[in-house]
């Protein structure tokens, strides 16, 4: 064997955002023949060796970093890429709006605004079919989303979440859809 | 309450063996890992080895792999080590020590330790 | 040589605080490991004081108090007294070997 054991991947199923009380189940894949897995939620000492981890209802003390690893003979593995597991729906609800309207021309400009009554510092915009959300390279952390010079690929339904940096997998329920219209 | 006790230590030669035991009572001693952790004479603390609840499970640290065999008996509520191809630098006390469990979740901590055996290597 | 880094002895007056640092790299305390402290008076069996970082297990008095951050740790003692006298290990996990690891420890002296 030479060099490290290539790290397993980790996945949340149905998805990494989780409503409260909903299930999740994660799962760390690494090659056939594995002789030890073992899953850990950093920042917190726990772990369990084995693949999967079935969370039959979300809860608060769950939400968190992931990590898995697995073990062959005496070797162990890099470890997979971190996977966040968030707790949606423990707050209200933001609003989510376009501005100017959500009809837009192909080749305008759009900017899509989360608000919400809590005085959170964090907002996460995700487009229905997109497994990661919406980042502006630069300000994707704000109550505004400005897209630039849109694409019929911009089309579709919109959903936005606000937190706190503080606890930043506690995240509020979904903003109603919003459908952008690109004409 | 929950109790670990070693015994099995003594004076060794080098290039001898010796099998450590450690007794557990007051939990449920098929659920937790267990370690074995050291102590030379005047020095700080170093982790041995770590087995799984069902022994299947099982971790050295680099000082004694190959050399030491951390096994478990469920059934009897006990712990071993087995210590081969022994060195001067294998003399300390051998502590046992559980991990901290709660419901499904294994913790990276000790929350209760034995009060320790003593292995002596020494011609 | 330890893992962790501690310094190898600290000493205080009745009453003063002392703390105990406890230093790490980016595969144990920096990976997202936590710190756990552990007491270890003269002639006896190491005693869980900290875990996680700064939780007290129930029995340890809320003079002892600690913290993380970044790659290191420390352990706080105020209203320092004769009994506190006694060796302190810090520990996490390091995440190359999955190996439990240990500080040097610190050996701590009430003075007069």
């Known amino acids: 064997q030479s060099g490290p054991l290539p790290k397993p991947s980790l996945q949340a199923l149905p998805s990494s955002l989780v409503p409260l009380e909903k299930p999740v189940t994660l799962r760390c894949q690494g090659p056939p023949g594995v002789d030890l897995y073992r899953l850990e939620k950093l920042s917190s000492s726990r772990y369990q060796d084995q693949a999967v981890l079935f969370i039959p209802a979300m809860k608060r003390s769950l939400a968190g970093r992931y990590r898995c690893s697995y073990q062959n003979g005496s070797l162990w593995s890099l470890p997979s890429d971190q996977l966040e597991l968030v707790a949606t729906g423990v707050f209200a609800k933001p609003s989510l709006s376009a501005q100017p309207g959500p009809a837009v021309s192909s080749g305008g400009d759009v900017t899509l605004q989360c608000q919400t009554r809590y005085g959170f510092d964090q907002f996460a915009l995700y487009k229905e079919g997109d497994p990661a959300p919406y980042k502006n390279p630069e300000r994707w952390y704000r109550a505004s989303f400005p897209i630039i010079t849109v694409t019929a690929a911009h089309s579709g339904t919109y959903r936005c979440y606000s937190f706190s940096s503080r606890d930043p997998y506690l995240w509020s329920a979904p903003s109603d859809p919003l459908e952008l219209v690109v004409t | 309450q929950v109790q670990l006790v070693e015994s099995g230590g003594g004076l060794v030669k080098p290039g001898g063996s010796l099998r450590l035991s450690c007794a557990a009572s007051g939990f449920s001693f098929g659920d937790y890992y267990v370690s074995w952790i050291r102590q030379a004479p005047g020095k700080g603390l170093e982790w041995v080895s770590a087995i799984g609840g069902s022994g299947s499970a099982v971790q050295y640290a680099e000082s004694v792999k190959g050399r030491f065999t951390i096994s478990r008996d469920n059934a009897k509520n006990s712990l071993y080590l087995q210590m081969n191809s022994l060195r001067a630098e294998d003399t300390a006390v051998y502590y046992c020590a559980r991990h901290y469990r709660e419901f499904r979740w294994h913790y990276y901590y000790f929350d209760y330790w034995g009060q320790g055996t003593l292995v002596t290597v020494s011609s | 040589q330890s893992v962790l880094t501690q310094p190898p002895s600290v000493s205080g007056a009745p009453g003063q605080r002392v703390t105990i640092s406890c230093t790490g790299s980016s595969s144990n305390i920096g990976a997202g490991y936590d710190v756990h402290w552990y007491q270890q008076l003269p002639g006896t069996a190491p005693k869980l004081l900290i875990y996680g970082n700064s939780n007290r297990p129930s029995g340890v008095p809320d003079r002892f108090s600690g913290s993380k951050s970044g790659t290191s740790a420390s352990l706080a003692i105020t209203g320092l007294q004769a009994e506190d006298e006694a060796d302190y290990y810090c520990?996490?996990?390091?995440?190359?070997?999955?190996?439990?690891?240990f500080g040097g420890g610190t050996k701590l002296t009430v003075l007069g």
């Open positions: 520990q996490s996990h390091d995440l190359g070997a999955h190996v439990w690891v």
